[in-house]
């Protein structure tokens, strides 16, 4: 988890605090988007469940030219545990329907909300 | 460039069908998957389907399943939708797009209308 914090990060950040960043992050995108975020572009939806940060990294992560999101690309990198790259989807990804990335913004950040509050913060 | 141009909208009856194309230029057709996407008036952006770049997997919204078919003909760069047993419900502008990028790249779209 050391890369979590960023490059000021001088060490380790506490994966609450990693959280609490990734949850900041997606607020700043939902509030502070005009347009479409990402122009309308579709994404896989995710299962909120196990293996959800590398999911929903599988899915952004196809999304290119889209500076709104990259913040949050670098972010969910650290949350999983092996490397993702584009087109990859694992198991745990069920390809079932795509919804706009503005929305699917808005899911993660809700039920990363739910997370925090209950301190499952891994 | 990328440049998408769907063909094929217009007006039918519920239960009827109508085939969709989208002829694609500007880019590797054969590397990308392709989406068809769909905005019903005063509504917003609705997934429809999804096929892979080889033709070899396809993808459907609970919507349109077991009703809709998408295909793709790489050697002639285009995208199909046939639209089976339509539905009031089904009327919306139908959007070919390159997998995952913005509407920016997008075409002008395909109006469908299912009415009696």
């Known amino acids: 988890l050391t890369c979590l914090g960023g490059f000021a990060s001088p060490g380790p950040v506490p994966p609450s605090t990693a959280l609490r960043e990734l949850i900041e992050e997606l607020v700043n995108i939902t509030q502070n988007q005009k347009a479409p975020l990402c122009n309308g572009s579709m994404v896989w939806s995710i299962n909120l469940t196990a293996g959800m940060y590398c999911a929903a990294l599988e899915s952004l992560i196809n999304v290119s030219g889209c500076s709104a999101i990259e913040k949050t690309q670098r972010m969910l990198s650290g949350f999983c545990p092996h490397k993702v790259s584009a087109g990859q989807f694992s198991s745990l990804h069920v390809r079932d329907t795509k919804i706009e990335v503005a929305q699917f913004v808005k899911d993660l950040l809700l039920h990363l909300k739910k997370l925090f509050r209950e301190g499952q913060f891994n | 460039e990328v440049q998408l141009l769907e063909s094929g909208g217009g007006l039918v009856q519920p239960g009827g069908s109508l085939r969709l194309s989208c002829a694609a230029s500007?880019?590797?057709?054969?590397?990308?998957?392709m989406d068809w996407v769909r905005q019903a008036p005063g509504k917003g952006l609705e997934w429809v389907s999804t096929?892979?770049?080889?033709?070899?997997?396809?993808y459907y919204a609970d919507s349109v399943k077991g009703r809709f078919t998408i295909s793709r003909d790489n050697s002639k760069n285009t995208l199909y939708l046939q639209m089976n047993s339509l539905r009031v419900e089904d009327t919306a502008v139908y959007y070919c797009?390159?997998?995952?990028?913005?509407?920016?790249?997008w075409g002008q779209g395909t109006l469908v209308t299912v009415s009696s």
């Open positions: 500007g880019f590797t057709f054969d590397e990308y998957g």
């Open positions: 096929i892979s770049p080889n033709g070899q997997s396809t």
């Open positions: 797009a390159k997998e995952y990028d913005s509407f920016d790249y």
